[in-house]
Amino acid sequence: KSSNEATNITPKHNMKAFLDELKAENIKKFLYNFTQIPHLAGTEQNFQLAKQIQSQWKEFGLDSVELAHYDVLLSYPNKTHPNYISIINEDGNEIFNTSLFEPPPPGYENVSDIVPPFSAFSPQGMPEGDLVYVNYARTEDFFKLERDMKINCSGKIVIARYGKVFRGNKVKNAQLAGAKGVILYSDPADYFAPGVKSYPDGWNLPGGGVQRGNILNLNGAGDPLTPGYPANEYAYRRGIAEAVGLPSIPVHPIGYYDAQKLLEKMGGSAPPDSSWRGSLKVPYNVGPGFTGNFSTQKVKMHIHSTNEVTRIYNVIGTLRGAVEPDRYVILGGHRDSWVFGGIDPQSGAAVVHEIVRSFGTLKKEGWRPRRTILFASWDAEEFGLLGSTEWAEENSRLLQERGVAYINADSSIEGNYTLRVDCTPLMYSLVHNLTKELKSPDEGFEGKSLYESWTKKSPSPEFSGMPRISKLGSGNDFEVFFQRLGIASGRARYTKNWETNKFSGYPLYHSVYETYELVEKFYDPMFKYHLTVAQVRGGMVFELANSIVLPFDCRDYAVVLRKYADKIYSISMKHPQEMKTYSVSFDSLFSAVKNFTEIASKFSERLQDFDKSNPIVLRMMNDQLMFLERAFIDPLGLPDRPFYRHVIYAPSSHNKYAGESFPGIYDALFDIESKVDPSKAWGEVKRQIYVAAFTVQAAAETLSEVA
């Protein structure tokens, strides 16, 4: 039930008052303000924006707003020695060079400090060699190349198309394959939707547009030089050789005009099947090397970027809770952008700004939330979730004891088709109930609820009449809160129609063309989708901070645990002989899930019946709900990933963006048929089943009656 029971409030100060105060026009105005110049992490411009946001949040009425700074490892191109890729002839002469920057969008011709496209944290180097086309550079793409096609990438420069998985995973895979350099490019098959014009006349990627991005494999570490601890004034920093997650080979991104020039000369093997072909007018030959006439030509990379310890600034705003000030509900999103940040992140930051303004308005009228709400404008998200991770490392003791929930607020839109939600199962019922109360902004759904349009357009694959809610993966600032600290987390944004638009992300992602005009002209002219996202994010925060009983339903965790156990069991059962040989049993896991289901059911019954006027009992029950997510944390972390500590969910080892369930067991089973020591490999599967079963059982027991 939606609540309006916080202290010191008049009846009008309820969820409705908060939601009614949110205005599309304000979000539009804030987005414009945040996108007129670049706000790259570590720059003066982004520091000035941090101070502006601090000042405005104070004006809006928050109790306190502080800057939290850290000195972290960032990466920038060399201003006088630009990065590029060339084709060289047998004499070493450069006969083709890729472009050094994107042509500026109209109206932005005279803007300074636009960082040219680069792969952040690429090491310096000038490797030259034959090219191998590796499709998306996924694990399965390298399996196809190496195992089926017998193509060796060792000593080669690989060219991979963006999409499907996080770029850092592509680079890691290329490194493991022995490549000496990686070229990343945006293929029109993935970044140019049919029937849509390219920017500035539509939302498609022009040929000269390039996706920036970091290529780290941090696995939740935060600043590469201070894993586990904040990068503060007295930090001990690792040497660069010991830094976490840095790539070891040069990497550089290009657009499809330049990719055409590299790919059109490719020789060697034909593509293995149609899934390796993009939309350029090239053969998509795999290589290695160029075809007959051009076989003496090589590709050379020229990468001169530098890694620098640089100061970053988070903005942390506090709205103190009236009843439980030591319980924190956090709304956070990043502020730093690659260039203008029209979508990523400022469409999210503008929504956060309006949510803060609305909460501030209520506070000025005498209202306070029951619990403390923390608002965060994170820095250096684009460089590896650094701002949020460092702050969480600095405040981990407080957060693990007091953290109720974290709601993420990066890009509010990646399309304008329907809602997309990823969250802990604890929040499923909260999201369902909230969206039933909100109006749908979608055409054809006038007067209908958001829940209805969302369910119609994005139905759950398992439960009819319900919308799809996805697992949390990573690639955004919720990571440290959920995967490391075990704080219940969720995110919501408007998305595209995945059925009809199979391109990856949105076409102009991390390019110079991600402008205010992109949003205002093509995605959301009325800012009605932004407003809806503000209502969902803000509404979740309101309920989490204000409801007397936390709006978590532990029974939904029971349901998914059973689903995930069934799934991992079926994966294991692809090897029935080995399971028999090595006595692999999932009985302990299924038993733990059964126990969890029964205990969760009993807890829910008690939750309906207990005396809510007894503050001690109320606090006790709420603490059991708050600490349930925490109970899934294994202090030892996952194998080789100590900062991914959640036993039920982790970012996929093959794609940081995707969530994997029972990741310890999943990774132990992955490609197990190729392991050199099957006994050891199946022993690790058994160990991971044991860890998972123990953790589920231990979590169940936190919901038992305390005495």
Epitope: N97, P106, S198
Partner: antibody, heavy 119, light 107 residues
């Protein structure tokens, strides 16, 4: 076959107006940017203006912005250039040209129409 | 505005010669450089776009290269029909600007 035919040129007095037209055929007109480029007698080429697919965005040489207006009628496969307050230095051959998108080259050109501004 | 400087402004060459024309931009134009050929009394014709891509129907003796601010048009073996004026043009930013032209004459 792509064909662009300009018309509307002629002799005009300083301060006068002229409307140039360009009739397009052999391609889907609404799928292309269009542009006007001029060439003064014995001189090089000078870009004047271009217009996007549906006419919602127009771009001009700064010095001509207040006097020249580019427009299009996709239903008629036609491009226009309205020229006001003409000056002697506007005397040139005016070419209509097709472009793929905002940054693309002008891949096909008309034969040009001559505008002479003289008293 | 971006200034485009072509050199030479004219050159004399014989059939079969290799001819090189250069174009320098006043700032980096990120390879958005096009080359046109114009014969007396005729409209310009596109030869090369985006530095090095040959427009359809253009003979392969024409080629382009360059990046940053410096670009080159090369005619590998001059043919009688190639005697004309050649213009470079940047498409990187507004206003679109042309070079002053290079007139290729018969020696």
């Amino acid at each position: 076959e792509v064909k662009l035919v300009e018309s509307g040129g002629g002799l005009v007095q300083p301060g006068g107006s002229l409307r140039l037209s360009c009739a397009a055929s052999g391609f889907t007109f609404s799928d292309y940017y269009m542009a006007w480029v001029r060439q003064a007698p014995g001189k090089g080429l000078e870009w004047v203006a271009n217009i996007n697919y549906d006419g919602s965005s127009t771009y001009y040489l700064d010095s001509l912005k207040s006097r020249f207006t580019i427009s299009r009628d996709n239903a008629k496969n036609s491009l226009y250039l309205q020229m006001n307050s003409l000056r002697a230095e506007d005397t040139a051959v005016y070419y209509c040209a097709r472009g793929g998108d905002y940054w693309d080259a002008m891949d096909y050109w008309g034969q040009g129409t001559t505008v002479t501004v003289s008293s | 505005d971006i200034q485009m400087t072509q050199s030479p402004s004219s050159l004399s060459a014989s059939v079969g010669d290799r001819v090189t024309i250069t174009c320098r931009a006043s700032q980096d134009i990120s390879k958005y450089l096009n080359w046109y050929q114009q014969k007396p009394g005729k409209a310009p014709k596109l030869l090369i776009y985006y530095t090095s891509s040959l427009h359809s129907g253009v003979p392969s003796r024409f080629s382009g290269s360059g990046s940053g601010t410096d670009y080159t048009l090369t005619i590998s073996s001059l043919q009688p029909e190639d005697f004309a004026t050649y213009y470079c043009q940047q498409g990187n930013r507004l206003p679109r600007t042309f070079g002053g032209g290079t007139k290729v004459e018969i020696k």
